[in-house]
Interface confidence: low
C-alpha cells in the first residue's frame, strides 16, 4: 500500500494532525525532499556568519563569513579570522611567520621555506614571510655546455661519442 505521505512534495510536510494532508512548511523551516513528516528548521546565519543564500521552503539557508573572516568545515560550519599574508592565526591572534617560514594566504599556517639544497639546487630568490624561496638550477646544471634538462651522459662505449 502506498504511503499517502509520499505524495507530499518538497516544501511541505505530511501533517498527521490533519489526516495526512500536505501542509506548507511554516516560516523559517524547509523540506528539501518529498514525503517528509516534518520540516527542518532553517539555519540562521547569526553573528560572524552572513547569509549567502536565504532559506526557502525547499532549501536550507547557506552561510558564509563576514569580511575579515573565512569559512571552515563542511557547509561553512565555522568562521575563522583572516590574517595578513606573512602571518598565521594563533590563540593570541594573528602572529608574524617565524624566520624560515612563510604564508602567502590570509588563512592557514606558516610553512617552512623550501630547502633547495635537498634537491641539489641553489637559492635563486630569498624567501620572505609572505613568499617561499625560489630555487635555481643546481651548480652541476650551470657547468659549461650543460643543460638543466639533459640527463647525465651514459658511460662511453667504443665507437660512440658522448651526447
Amino acid at each position: 500500500l502506498q504511503d499517502p505521505c509520499s505524495n507530499c512534495p518538497a516544501g511541505t510536510f505530511c501533517d498527521n494532525n490533519r489526516r495526512q494532508i500536505c501542509s506548507p512548511c511554516p516560516p523559517n523551516s524547509f523540506s528539501s525532499a518529498g514525503g517528509q513528516r516534518t520540516c527542518d528548521i532553517c539555519r540562521q546565519c547569526k553573528g560572524v556568519f552572513r547569509t549567502r543564500k536565504e532559506c526557502s521552503s525547499t532549501s536550507n539557508a547557506e552561510c558564509d563569513c563576514t569580511p575579515g573572516f573565512h569559512c571552515l568545515g563542511a557547509g561553512c560550519s565555522m568562521c575563522e579570522q583572516d590574517c595578513k599574508q606573512g602571518q598565521e592565526l594563533t590563540k593570541k591572534g594573528c602572529k608574524d611567520c617565524c624566520f624560515g617560514t612563510f604564508n602567502d594566504q590570509k588563512r592557514g599556517i606558516c610553512r617552512p621555506w623550501t630547502n633547495c639544497s635537498l634537491d641539489g639546487k641553489s637559492v635563486l630568490v630569498n624567501g620572505t614571510k609572505e613568499r617561499d624561496v625560489v630555487c635555481g638550477p643546481s651548480p652541476a646544471d650551470l657547468s659549461p655546455g650543460a643543460s638543466s634538462v639533459t640527463p647525465p651522459a651514459p658511460a662511453r662505449e667504443p665507437g660512440h661519442s658522448p651526447q
Epitope: 546565519c45 547569526k46 563576514t66 569580511p67 579570522q81 590574517c83 593570541k92 594573528c94 590570509k106
Partner: antibody, heavy 117, light 107 residues
Framework: QVQLQESGPGLVKPSETLSITCTVS????????VHWVRQPPGKGLEGLGV???????NYNSALMSRLTISKDNSKSQVSLKMSSLTAADTAMYYC???????????WGQGTTVTVSS | DIQMTQSPSSLSASLGDRVTISCSAS??????LNWYQQKPDGTVKLLIY???TLHSGVPSRFSGSGSGTDFTLTISSLQPEDVATYYC?????????FGGGTKLEIK
C-alpha cells in the same frame, strides 16, 4: 577594562588631510575590528569604515576615495586619514570596537574636528 | 547602501510612559540590527544587538523587536536617565549604516 581614545588636531584647513588616531587599551587589535563613525554638529551618526583584525578594510562608498584606515598592532593604534577636507567634514569623530558578532560594544569619547581656514 | 529611517525624529514623553521608536530599512536585513544610545554629553553606548538581545548591563525596561525591514525599540517605563538620542544600525550589508536618530525628551 577596554577603552578607546581618539586624538586629533582639532582644527584643519580646507583641502588638507585629516589624521586621527584611536588608541585601544585592554583589548587586542588582532582579535577585534575598529570602526570609525562621525557626527556632524546637530546631525546623526555616519559610519566611515572599518579595519578588521587581519588588517583588511571596508569603507563608506561615498567617502572611499578620500579615506584610508590603517593600524599598528604593536602600538594598539588605529589611524584614520581623510584627504581633501571641506567644511562638510566638520564633525565629532568616534572610533568603536567591533566584536565578532558585529556590534560596536565600546566607543571612544570622540574628538572634535573643525575644518576652517 | 542600505538606508535606515527612524521615526519619530524627536519625541517628548512623561516619566513612567511606554515609549516606542521605529526603524525601517530600505531592504530586508533579517535580524541584523543594533540599537545605540547617545547621551547629551556625546557618550555612545550599545543597548541591543541582533534586533532583540540586550547588551550586558542594559536595564530590562529596554527591548527590541522586528524582522526584515521594520524594527522597534521599546522603553517600558521611561526613566530620567533615558533622555538621549537613539540610533538603529544595520549590519546586514557593508557599509553598515545608521538611522537618523530619535531624540527623546521628558515632558
Amino acid at each position: 577594562q577596554v577603552q578607546l581614545q581618539e586624538s586629533g588636531p582639532g582644527l584643519v584647513k580646507p583641502s588638507e588631510t585629516l589624521s586621527i588616531t584611536c588608541t585601544v587599551s585592554g583589548s587586542s587589535l588582532t582579535s577585534y575590528g575598529v570602526h570609525w563613525v562621525r557626527q556632524p554638529p546637530g546631525k546623526g551618526l555616519e559610519g566611515l569604515g572599518v579595519i578588521w583584525p587581519g588588517g583588511s578594510t571596508n569603507y563608506n562608498s561615498a567617502l572611499m576615495s578620500r579615506l584610508t584606515i590603517s593600524k599598528d598592532n604593536s602600538k594598539s593604534q588605529v589611524s584614520l586619514k581623510m584627504s581633501s577636507l571641506t567644511a562638510a567634514d566638520t564633525a565629532m569623530y568616534y572610533c568603536a570596537r567591533v566584536t565578532g558578532t558585529w556590534y560596536f560594544d565600546v566607543w571612544g569619547q570622540g574628538t572634535t574636528v573643525t575644518v576652517s581656514s | 547602501d542600505i538606508q535606515m529611517t527612524q521615526s519619530p525624529s524627536s519625541l517628548s514623553a512623561s516619566l513612567g510612559d511606554r515609549v516606542t521608536i521605529s526603524c525601517s530599512a530600505s531592504q530586508g536585513i533579517s535580524n541584523y540590527l543594533n540599537w545605540y544610545q547617545q547621551k547629551p554629553d556625546g557618550t555612545v553606548k550599545l543597548l541591543i544587538y541582533y534586533t532583540s538581545t540586550l547588551h550586558s548591563g542594559v536595564p530590562s525596561r529596554f527591548s527590541g523587536s522586528g524582522s526584515g525591514t521594520d524594527f522597534t525599540l521599546t522603553i517600558s517605563s521611561l526613566q530620567p536617565e533615558d533622555v538621549a538620542t537613539y540610533y538603529c544600525q544595520q549590519y546586514s550589508k557593508l557599509p553598515w549604516t545608521f538611522g537618523g536618530g530619535t531624540k527623546l525628551e521628558i515632558k
